[in-house]
């Protein structure tokens, strides 16, 4: 806490500029008027203030605004925003998007701090869902930002926002979180026609029930192994040896390499070997001819 | 305050049916992912079905077909319409709240026991 | 679907003593892409439902006290109570819910000795 002293004759600041970067901390806390400060919040990030002359600033825009900062002053903190804690940030009601980008700009290149992660949190809740503009600002910031948000907070995104999405944007999404998003990216590219639609599910795939993979198996679609290796096991397991031959197209080859890994190893416990051995890739493991399997579920435990 | 209060248990005969009932307070049932989870007498704790706030629904492969997980947003509650009830359906039923939809459960209700006796 | 087993099925310690409850998947419950364990530990006590205690493996939930830990990672992991307490006496299970359906342990009994 600066102590309250009386401002020296003749400093007393009448607009916000560099002879300030001259000031002690007492004299920056006695010689600003606060008031001053927030009209004129634009000019700060100009100056190359020290961090213990931020810390004064931001004491005397808590004192004004103990009810929280109005937006005006938070679309030029700048630099100061640094200095805000997630406490002071919950007290803030930000609404529009430049305000957010120009926070957002300032902690550019680095890790999402728990400052950041307030922020964009009041922002989309004041918002009341994830519309396809913040989406856009926020994955171009954080492309992890869409797989830091839980499958709940994920069930509000609008279909319309899915388009905003990059496949980079989902590399760390688990099955749970693509299982809330797939639906909704199948209703926002539900127009395309079969091969641009492909190219635009299948990052998502890996929420896409059987049945879907079962038709896309019907349209030439050629999957790569990656994409395979990332759907949902049980969405694989009833596949048949002809299905998958199809999806994959002329990356059926990859299964070899991939025999032992989820779920190309629980798929083959499921086939019967007389199919595997259509591919002609060597696959080992299936069903021995001859046997009769009278419960799926029973094979897939002995497993 | 979080609360999550089960009734509709009781003791019904093999092939009966009953519905569940889980009033919730605190929360909106539909902003979350709601969950029931069972457990036999002396035994452990089984999933049995989930609702995603979205309204998908999946289900435990020992009651597919046979329980229906469903909400009314106007009364805030979950419900869980049990038919051709089995003996080893027999468990305190309790419905919870699944922590941002991840699988873990965060807030749970006291339970309700159903017991499938002729 | 994932089998939880837990080590032991009950446990005997002195007030104040060290507790460790072991939690084994049938598969990794890691997943690879985020680096986060999908695995939770719940007390249950006589009566009443689970409580949750631990979650992401090591994650405290609110209100739960310090003396409770979780660790480990892809199919192994524990729960340490450090240093136990009379209240402490309940059944934990650990659950899994890297894929669906969540799965659960068979439960670990700690009683005091």
């Known amino acids: 806490e600066v102590e309250k002293t009386a401002c020296p004759s003749g400093k007393k600041a009448r607009e916000i500029d560099e002879s300030l970067i001259f000031y002690k901390k007492w004299e920056l806390e006695a010689c600003v008027d606060a008031a001053l400060l927030a009209t004129q919040m634009d000019r700060v990030n100009a100056i190359p203030f020290t961090y213990e002359q931020l810390d004064v600033l931001k004491h005397k825009l808590d004192e004004l605004y103990p009810q929280g900062y109005p937006e005006s002053v938070i679309q030029h903190l700048g630099y100061l925003f640094l200095k805000m804690s997630p406490e002071d940030i919950r007290k803030w009601n930000v609404t529009s998007l430049e305000t957010l980008k120009a926070l957002l700009e300032v902690n550019k290149g680095h890790e999402m701090s728990p400052q950041v992660a307030t922020l964009i949190d009041r922002f989309v809740k004041g918002r009341g869902q994830l519309d396809k503009d913040t989406l856009d600002t926020l994955t171009a910031f954080y492309p992890g930002y869409l797989c830091s948000l839980s499958p709940e907070e994920l069930s509000s995104v609008p279909p319309s926002s899915i388009w905003a999405v990059r496949p980079q944007d989902l590399d760390t999404c688990d099955p749970r979180q693509l299982d809330v998003l797939y639906p909704k990216a199948r209703l926002a590219f539900q127009n395309m026609n079969g091969s641009e639609y492909f190219v635009k599910i299948q990052s998502f795939l890996g929420g896409a029930p059987t049945e879907d993979l079962k038709a896309l198996s019907q349209q030439n679609v050629s999957m790569d192994l990656a994409t395979f290796m990332k759907l949902r096991t049980d969405a694989v397991l009833p596949l048949t040896v002809a299905e998958v031959q199809k999806l994959l197209g002329p990356h059926v080859e990859g299964l070899k390499a991939e025999e032992r890994h989820r779920p190309v190893r629980d798929w083959i416990l499921r086939q019967r070997q007389d199919d595997l051995d259509t591919l002609g890739l060597g696959l080992q493991g299936g069903i021995p001819n001859g046997y009769l399997v009278l419960d799926l579920s029973m094979q897939e435990a002995l497993s | 305050e979080v609360q999550l209060v089960e009734s509709g248990g009781g003791l019904i005969q093999p092939g009966g049916s009953l519905r569940l009932s889980c009033a919730v307070s605190?929360?909106?049932?539909?902003?979350?992912?709601m969950t029931w989870v069972r457990q036999a007498p002396g035994k452990g704790l089984e999933w049995v079905s989930v609702?995603?706030?979205?309204?998908?629904?999946y289900y435990a492969d020992s009651v597919k077909g046979r329980f229906t997980i469903s909400r009314d947003n106007s009364k805030n509650t979950l419900y869980l319409q049990m038919n051709s009830l089995r003996a080893e359906d027999t468990a305190v039923y309790y419905c919870a709240r699944d922590s941002g939809g991840w699988g873990y459960f965060d807030y749970w209700g006291q339970g309700t026991l159903v017991t499938v006796s002729s | 679907d994932i089998v939880m087993t837990q080590s032991p099925d009950s446990l005997a310690v002195s007030l104040g003593e060290r507790a460790t409850i072991n939690c084994k998947s049938s598969?990794?419950?890691?997943?690879?892409?985020?680096?986060?364990?999908?695995l939770a530990w719940y007390q249950q006590k006589p009566g009443q439902p689970p409580k949750l205690l631990i979650y992401?493996?090591?994650t405290r939930e609110s209100g739960v006290p310090d003396r409770f830990s979780g660790s480990g990672s892809g199919t192994d992991f524990t729960l340490t109570i450090s240093s136990l307490q009379a209240e402490d006496v309940a059944v934990y299970y650990c659950q899994q819910y890297y894929s669906t359906p969540p799965t659960f342990g068979q439960g670990t009994k700690v009683e005091i000795k």
């Open positions: 609702i995603y706030s979205g309204g998908k629904t």
């Open positions: 992401w493996a090591s």
């Open positions: 605190g929360f909106t049932v539909s902003s979350k992912f």
């Open positions: 598969q990794s419950v890691l997943y690879s892409s985020n680096n986060k364990n999908y």
